[in-house]
Interface confidence: medium
C-alpha cells in the first residue's frame, strides 16, 4: 500500500455540498473505491466484470456517487464545520494485475461561504 497527497483538486464545492473526486487509471477494469473520513469508511463502491463483460456495481456503505471511466465522485450534502477533516480515497485495484492498494488524501477546509444554510 502507498499513501500520498492527491496532486489534483479533490474537493469541488456546490450548493452547500461537496463533490469528492477519487481518481483511478482508465486502464483499470475492476476495483473497490472507499471514501474515508479520518479512519472511518463513509462510502464504498466496487466495480467488477463478470462473464460476457457484464459490469456489476455494488456498494456496502452507500453514498450518492457517480462513476466515470477514470474516477468515482462521492457527494456529501448539508456541509457544516464537523465535515472539516482529512478525507482519503482508498483504491484497491483487482484488474489489471498486479493487485494494488493506494490511499490518496487531502484536507477538506470548510469556510462560511460553503455552508449550506448560512444565518443572515
Amino acid at each position: 500500500e502507498i499513501n500520498g497527497s492527491a496532486n489534483y483538486e479533490m474537493f469541488i464545492f456546490h450548493n452547500g455540498g461537496v463533490q469528492i473526486l477519487c481518481k483511478y487509471p482508465d486502464i483499470v477494469q475492476q476495483f473497490k473505491m472507499q471514501l474515508l473520513k479520518g479512519g472511518q469508511i463513509l462510502c464504498d463502491l466496487t466495480k467488477t466484470k463478470g462473464s460476457g463483460n457484464t459490469v456489476s456495481i455494488k456498494s456496502l456503505k452507500f453514498c450518492h456517487s457517480q462513476l466515470s471511466n477514470n474516477s468515482v465522485s462521492f457527494f456529501l450534502y448539508n456541509l457544516d464545520h464537523s465535515h472539516a477533516n482529512y478525507y482519503f480515497c482508498n483504491l484497491s485495484i483487482f484488474d489489471p494485475p498486479p493487485f494494488k492498494v493506494t490511499l490518496t488524501g487531502g484536507y477538506l477546509h470548510i469556510y462560511e461561504s460553503q455552508l449550506c444554510c448560512q444565518l443572515k
Epitope: 502507498i2 481518481k23 487509471p25 482508465d26 489489471p96 498486479p98 494494488k100 493506494t102 490518496t104
Partner: antibody, heavy 127, light 112 residues
Framework: QVQLVESGGGLVKPGGSLRLSCAAS????????MSWIRQAPGKGLEWVSY????????YYADSVKGRFTISRDNAKNSLYLQINSLRAEDTAVYYC????????????????????WGQGTTVTVSS | DIVMTQSPLSLPVTPGEPASISCRSS???????????LDWYLQKPGQSPQLLIY???NRASGVPDRFSGSGSGTDFTLKISRVEAEDVGVYYC?????????FGQGTKVEIK
C-alpha cells in the same frame, strides 16, 4: 479511442531546430507522465525524455541533454519536444508515448507499461 | 545506466512451435514494492511498438494468452507458447526502474 498523433518532423540541416508535437485524445492527458522515444533507421529503440503530469519532473537521456526540451500543455492535451543543435545522429522516427499514471504527489506509483504509442514522426538531419 | 542484453538477436521460428527470448539486466530490476520493472514490446514490420508484458509478467490488455513473461531480478524470459504468423517482428525488453529507461538490442523473430 485512446490515441496519440505526432507531427512536426521534417528535413533539417545540422545545427538546425524543430518542434515536435503530440496530440492526445481519448484519455485524461493531465493524469499521465508522457515520454518521447526514438528509433534511428534500422536501429533499436532509444528513450529520449519524459515529463510528469504537471510538468514539474523532467528527465532526459544524456545524448540529448542541453539540446532537447520536453514540455506539455494540459489544457491543449499536447506534448512537445523542442530539438535544437541537431546532429546527423538525431535522425530517427520520434514516438510519443503514455507512461506512468500520476495522481499522487511525487510518486509515480501506477505503472502499466508504456501502453499507448503514436505512429511516429520522422526527423531527418542532413546537409 | 542499466544495460539490457537480449538473446538471441535473431530467432527463426516454425508456426505452432514454442519460442523463447531472454533478457538480462546489468542491475536488479526488482523494486522495493516487490515488482520487477521490466516490460516487453513488439514492433511489427512498419508499425509502432506495442506493449506485450509489463512489470515482468503481466499481459497488457488485448494481448493473446500465448504470450507470457517470467523472471525476477536480472533474468527475464518472454515465451510464446505457439507462434503464429502474425507474431513476426522485433521484440524489445525495456527496464523502467531507473532513468534513463533502457532497451535491449531487440530480437528479430521471423518465420523459417
Amino acid at each position: 479511442q485512446v490515441q496519440l498523433v505526432e507531427s512536426g518532423g521534417g528535413l533539417v540541416k545540422p545545427g538546425g531546430s524543430l518542434r515536435l508535437s503530440c496530440a492526445a485524445s481519448g484519455f485524461t492527458f493531465s493524469d499521465y507522465y508522457m515520454s518521447w522515444i526514438r528509433q534511428a533507421p534500422g536501429k533499436g529503440l532509444e528513450w529520449v525524455s519524459y515529463i510528469s503530469s504537471s510538468g514539474s519532473t523532467i528527465y532526459y537521456a544524456d545524448s540529448v541533454k542541453g539540446r532537447f526540451t520536453i514540455s506539455r500543455d494540459n489544457a491543449k492535451n499536447s506534448l512537445y519536444l523542442q530539438i535544437n543543435s541537431l546532429r546527423a545522429e538525431d535522425t530517427a522516427v520520434y514516438y510519443c508515448a503514455r507512461d506512468f499514471y500520476d495522481i499522487l504527489t511525487d510518486s509515480p506509483y501506477f505503472y502499466y507499461g508504456v501502453d499507448v504509442w503514436g505512429q511516429g514522426t520522422t526527423v531527418t538531419v542532413s546537409s | 545506466d542499466i544495460v539490457m542484453t537480449q538473446s538471441p538477436l535473431s530467432l527463426p521460428v516454425t508456426p505452432g512451435e514454442p519460442a523463447s527470448i531472454s533478457c538480462r539486466s546489468s542491475q536488479s530490476l526488482l523494486h522495493s514494492n516487490g515488482y520487477n520493472y521490466l516490460d516487453w514490446y513488439l514492433q511489427k514490420p512498419g508499425q509502432s511498438p506495442q506493449l506485450l508484458i509489463y512489470l515482468g509478467s503481466n499481459r497488457a490488455s488485448g494481448v493473446p494468452d500465448r504470450f507470457s513473461g517470467s523472471g525476477s531480478g536480472t533474468d527475464f524470459t518472454l515465451k510464446i507458447s505457439r507462434v503464429e504468423a502474425e507474431d513476426v517482428g522485433v521484440y524489445y525488453c525495456m527496464q523502467a526502474l531507473q532513468t534513463p529507461r533502457t532497451f535491449g538490442q531487440g530480437t528479430k523473430v521471423e518465420i523459417k
